[in-house]
């Protein structure tokens, strides 16, 4: 005999909620499985200039990705199969996987705010590495890709310690077109840009950090209630 | 031993065309910025143009733009000034030159260059 | 008209320290390395030095080059009568790319 009223509400809000969350992994795994493997994008986790390699942060970004998608696809699978099927222990091992979940993001929030200056320095330095290599070698199209996206998702172009060789192929060839960037290029210094991401702007990732641990919540009140639910509904 | 060798220069009428070339030894071409830099006979130098290794980025003095073009063929080690549209002041000894670039990305000179070929425009 | 300014000529006698300038502005040499070359009677320009103090292999130490603001200085100490050529010194300018001075020919006396 299955759950009724609001418990069965509560099952299917739970099953199409990690349904979700279940394809956003799969998404997230394919990406960074993608990025890992394609040629184009593989060269990216590997550009250095001369000896100087690519800063830890980004080699070691892409397996976490990976990693995150595999575990959001395990446990939006739990909680999908365990709301349908009704499963007590698989709900259990769903709202165990949420509480460690959690204790992660805390403690990932808690070493992000920490060491924030090194990651933005890391970002700093792998922006300057990737320009250098653009410019040097232009024929490193990964390392052009990277510039530009630099360049577009911050909005900016370049930083005032740049030399004048690369100011010239900045103006020229890598600034956003069609911005007033071109005409004005240190206004927008992209090691400016990083800076405010990380402290100005840290308030928006501590926002989606916060919106993140409140849905984990809610998962995690929604899964033992069906829980006892389908206990209470297997002793009648 | 590391070589520019320019040819291609002779005279020319007004209005007309010359294409230099300017072969490289004892380098690999391919991996480095190209410059052309001309000199009037008994004057002071004067930057023609430059070319980043694979030609992606291509710069012209303002004397020049619209009229010359440079291009590179990296697979036959050579380097190459399109010069359309002559004019009497382009008369000159043109040098093609390596360019050196150092650490961060700083321009540090042009360290090798050729022997020079003449160009006279001339009615 | 070259936007860095050389004297046209320097004289000194073997042995003396001469020195050569290349002013510019604040765009130009200011906030660039300069480089400068030698340029032997009848022969093609040769690199003598590169960003502002740095001698290629194969150039004498009695070469040498700084610079302080917005002017860079050249000196050659213990000259030579080979020495006798044309000075030129040049920036990468952002706007204007590969900006040569005007040229300084120097004349070895005696």
């Known amino acids: 005999m299955g759950v009724e009223g609001c418990t069965k509400c509560i099952k299917y809000l739970l099953f199409v909620f990690n349904f979700v969350f279940w394809l956003a992994g799969g998404v997230i795994l394919g990406v960074a499985l993608w990025l890992r493997h394609d040629p184009q994008t593989t060269n990216l986790l590997y550009l250095e200039l001369g000896d100087k390699p690519a800063p830890n942060t980004f080699y070691v970004g892409i397996y976490i990705l990976i990693a995150v998608g595999a575990v959001m696809m395990f446990v939006g699978f739990l909680g999908c199969y365990g709301a349908i099927q009704e499963s007590q222990c698989l709900l259990g091992t769903f709202f165990t996987c949420l509480v460690i979940l959690f204790a992660c993001e805390v403690a990932a929030g808690i070493w992000g705010f920490v060491n924030k200056d090194q990651i933005a320095k890391d970002v700093k330095q792998f922006y300057d590495q990737a320009l250098q290599q653009a410019v040097v070698d232009d024929d490193a199209n990964n390392a052009k890709a990277v510039v530009k996206t630099f360049h577009e998702t911050l909005d900016c172009c370049g930083s005032s310690t740049l030399s004048a060789l690369t100011t010239s192929v900045l103006k020229n060839n890598l600034c956003p077109s069609g911005s007033n960037i071109i005409s004005n290029l240190f206004k927008e210094d992209c090691h400016q840009k990083i800076d405010d991401l990380f402290s100005g702007k840290l308030y928006l990732i501590g926002i989606a950090a916060i919106v993140v641990a409140v849905i984990m919540i809610f998962e995690m009140i929604l899964s033992m209630v069906l829980c006892c639910g389908i206990r209470n509904s297997s002793v009648y | 031993e590391v070589q520019l060798l320019e040819s291609g220069g002779g005279l020319v009428q007004p209005g007309g065309s010359l294409r230099l070339s300017c072969a490289a030894s004892g380098f690999t071409l391919g991996s480095y910025w190209m410059s052309w830099v001309r000199q009037v006979p008994g004057k002071g130098l004067e930057w023609v143009s430059s070319?980043?290794?694979?030609?992606?980025?291509?710069y012209y003095a303002d004397s020049v733009k619209g009229r010359f073009t440079i291009s590179r063929d990296n697979s036959k080690n050579t380097l190459y000034l399109q010069m359309n549209s002559l004019r009497a002041e382009d008369t000159a000894v043109y040098y093609c030159?390596?360019?050196?670039?150092?650490?961060?990305?700083?321009?540090?000179?042009?360290?090798?260059w050729g022997q020079g070929t003449l160009v006279t425009v001339s009615s | 008209q070259s936007v860095l300014t050389q004297p046209p000529s320097a004289s000194g006698t073997p042995g003396q320290r001469v020195t050569i300038s290349c002013s510019g502005s604040s765009s130009n040499l200011g906030s660039n390395t300069v480089n400068w070359y030698q340029q032997l009677p009848g022969t093609a320009p040769k690199l003598l030095i590169y960003?502002?103090?740095n001698r290629p292999s194969g150039v004498p130490d009695r070469f040498s080059g700084s610079k302080s603001g917005t002017t860079a200085s050249l000196a050659i100490s213990g000259l030579r009568s080979e020495d006798e050529a044309d000075y030129y010194c040049?920036?990468?300018?952002?706007?204007?790319?590969?900006?040569f001075g005007g040229g300084t020919k120097l004349t070895v006396l005696g």
């Open positions: 960003g502002n103090s």
């Open positions: 030159a390596r360019q050196r670039i150092g650490d961060l990305v700083v321009h540090y000179g042009l360290d090798v």
């Open positions: 040049e920036v990468w300018d952002s706007d204007s790319y590969v900006t």
């Open positions: 070319i980043s290794s694979s030609s992606s980025y291509i």
